[in-house]
Interface confidence: low
Amino acid sequence: ESLGTEQRVVGRAAEVPGPEPGQQEQLVFGSGDAVELSCPPPGGGPMGPTVWVKDGTGLVPSERVLVGPQRLQVLNASHEDSGAYSCRQRLTQRVLCHFSVRVTDAPSSGDDEDGEDEAEDTGVDTGAPYWTRPERMDKKLLAVPAANTVRFRCPAAGNPTPSISWLKNGREFRGEHRIGGIKLRHQQWSLVMESVVPSDRGNYTCVVENKFGSIRQTYTLDVLERSPHRPILQAGLPANQTAVLGSDVEFHCKVYSDAQPHIQWLKHVEVNGSKVGPDGTPYVTVLKSWISESVEADVRLRLANVSERDGGEYLCRATNFIGVAEKAFWLSVHGPRAAEEELVEADEAGSVYAG
C-alpha cells in the first residue's frame, strides 16, 4: 500500500514509535489532531505484509485513514477514532504493535460526547428541519464485529427545535427491544447500542421533525460474527455467460471476509493439451491479484473485445489465513448468429444461474 505523504495536516501531528510486542501504548490525542502510529519491524529486520486493525476489525484506507506497512495515519481525528489499534503480520495475524488510543477535547470519561452537534440558534425565525452535518452521515452501511459499540448520528436543526425518534426496520425502536438496551442522546442526535449481536442487524432510521416538516435518514447495520472464517463468495448473476465475438463481458463476485483476503481472478488453461498437471491440480493463469482491504468487496473481472480463446472457465478465488473459497464462472464466445440463437433458446427455457 502507498501512504499519502503529500497530505497537508492541519493541527498537531504526533508520530508515535511502536511499543514492544505485548506492551500496550496508552495514547491520548486531541480532537482534530492527526493520529500517527508507527510500528517498525522487530529487530529492524524485514516485516513482511502487515495489516492494521482497530477494535478487532481491519482498517479500510480512505481519504482520512492512510495505511502503510509500518505506519498508520488518521487525519482529523474524532471521538469515533478512539479504540484499540494493533499492527499484525498479515499471514500469521501475530500482533507486532498494540496501541490504546483515546481522542478527547479534554480529560473526560470515555462515554462523554462533545456537544458540537447540539441544536443551536441559527437565526432563522421558523423553518423545517435540516441536517447540520451531512458529511458525517455519508456512511450508510456499517459492518462491525459483534461486541462492538455502534453509534448512529443524525445531527439536525430547525426552528422550533425538531424532535428525533428512531425506527428499526420501519417500526418504532425502544430500549426494551434489545438486550442491553439503547442510549438515546437527543442533545447529540444519536442512538448508541453497546455490545452489538447478530440480532441487531437491520435498517435504522432517524426521523427528525417539527411542525414545518420531517426529514429522515436510514442506516444499515451488519454485525459480523466474531469467530473468523474463510472467505464467503457470492457469484454475481449471471455466473454463466454467452458473448458475441468482439463484445465486452463482466463477471461479478462478492467477497466477504473479516480477515483481509487475497483475491484472485483465474482462468483455467491447457498446457500441452492437458487441463491438469501431473498431480491432478488444474492449470490456471492469474488474471488479477490483490489484497482486499475491506470486509466486503464487490470484485469485477472485465474482459474487453472477447475472442474465442477467451471462452472457458474462470475462477474468483479468495484466500485468508483460515482458508480458501472459489466460485466458478463460464464464458462461451460465439459468432453473432450463434450467440443470438443461444440467447433466444435460453430466454425461452428460462435462465439458469449458478449460485
Partner: antibody, heavy 120, light 106 residues
Framework: EIQLQQSGPELVKPGASVKVSCKAS????????MYWVKQSHGKSLEWIGY????????RDNQKFKGKATLTVDKSSSTAYMHLNSLTSEDSAVYYC?????????????WGQGTLVTVSA | QIVLTQSPALMSASPGEKVTMTCSAS?????MYWYQQKPRSSPKPWIY???NLASGVPARFSGSGSGTSYSLTISSMEAEDAATYYC?????????FGAGTKLELK
C-alpha cells in the same frame, strides 16, 4: 486523501518525445488500474489506454498504438506515459485518472492535467 | 467504435429551471457515465452506472436511460451547475466520450 499529482507543462519540438508522470498517494497503488486521457484545446476527451500497476499489463486505444507507451514504477507509486514522434496534433492536456474501484469502466479520481505543447 | 452524440451542444438555463441533456449511442450500451468539467479544471466524476450520483454531487442531479438513449437532468438549475458535461461508455472497445454539452447560466 487520494491524490494524483502530475508533472508540469512541457514545450517540445516536433519529432521529439516527452514523458508525463502521475504520482499517486493515499491508496494502494497496485490495486487499481491507471488510465490516461487526452483533451485537445476546446475539444472533448479521448481515452488513450490504461495500465494495471500490479503486473504492468496494458490495454490501448488502437488510435494511440505506437504513439503512447504506458509504464509504472511501483516503488514510487508513479505512472508514466511516454509520447513519441510528436506533432502539433499531439498538443493537448493529458490527464491520468484512477478507476473507481469496483466500477472499472469509469474514472473516479483525476490528476490536475499536464499541458503538452508541440511547437517549432 | 461506439459514437456518443450529446445534444444540445450548447444550452443556457435560468436559476430554478429544469435542465435535461441527452447522450445518444450509435449502438446499445450497458451503462452510461457522466463527468462535469469547468474551465481550467479536471473533469469531475458526476454520475456512474447510469443513475448513481458520485460523492458530493447535489441531489438535484439525476441520470437515466438504457440501450442507446441516456440523459442527465437537473431538477432546478443553480449558478454552480454551469459547466460542460461529458457522457462516456465502455460497453464496447474503445472507451469513448461524447463531445460534451456546455451548460451556461442565463
Amino acid at each position: 486523501e487520494i491524490q494524483l499529482q502530475q508533472s508540469g507543462p512541457e514545450l517540445v519540438k516536433p519529432g521529439a518525445s516527452v514523458k508525463v508522470s502521475c504520482k499517486a498517494s493515499g491508496y494502494a497503488f497496485t490495486s487499481y488500474n491507471m488510465y490516461w486521457v487526452k483533451q485537445s484545446h476546446g475539444k472533448s476527451l479521448e481515452w488513450i489506454g490504461y495500465i494495471d500497476p500490479y503486473n504492468g499489463g496494458t490495454r490501448d486505444n488502437q488510435k494511440f498504438k505506437g504513439k503512447a507507451t504506458l509504464t509504472v514504477d511501483k516503488s514510487s507509486s508513479t505512472a508514466y506515459m511516454h509520447l513519441n514522434s510528436l506533432t502539433s496534433e499531439d498538443s493537448a492536456v493529458y490527464y491520468c485518472a484512477r478507476e473507481g474501484g469496483n466500477y472499472e469502466a469509469w474514472f473516479a479520481y483525476w490528476g490536475q492535467g499536464t499541458l503538452v505543447t508541440v511547437s517549432a | 467504435q461506439i459514437v456518443l452524440t450529446q445534444s444540445p451542444a450548447l444550452m443556457s438555463a435560468s436559476p430554478g429551471e429544469k435542465v435535461t441533456m441527452t447522450c445518444s449511442a450509435s449502438s446499445s450500451v450497458s451503462y452510461m457515465y457522466w463527468y462535469q468539467q469547468k474551465p481550467r479544471s479536471s473533469p469531475k466524476p458526476w454520475i456512474y452506472l447510469t443513475s448513481n450520483l458520485a460523492s458530493g454531487v447535489p441531489a438535484r442531479f439525476s441520470g437515466s436511460g438504457s440501450g442507446t438513449s441516456y440523459s442527465l437532468t437537473i431538477s432546478s438549475m443553480e449558478a454552480e451547475d454551469a459547466a460542460t458535461y461529458y457522457c462516456q461508455q465502455w460497453s464496447s472497445n474503445p472507451l469513448t466520450f461524447g463531445a460534451g454539452t456546455k451548460l451556461e447560466l442565463k
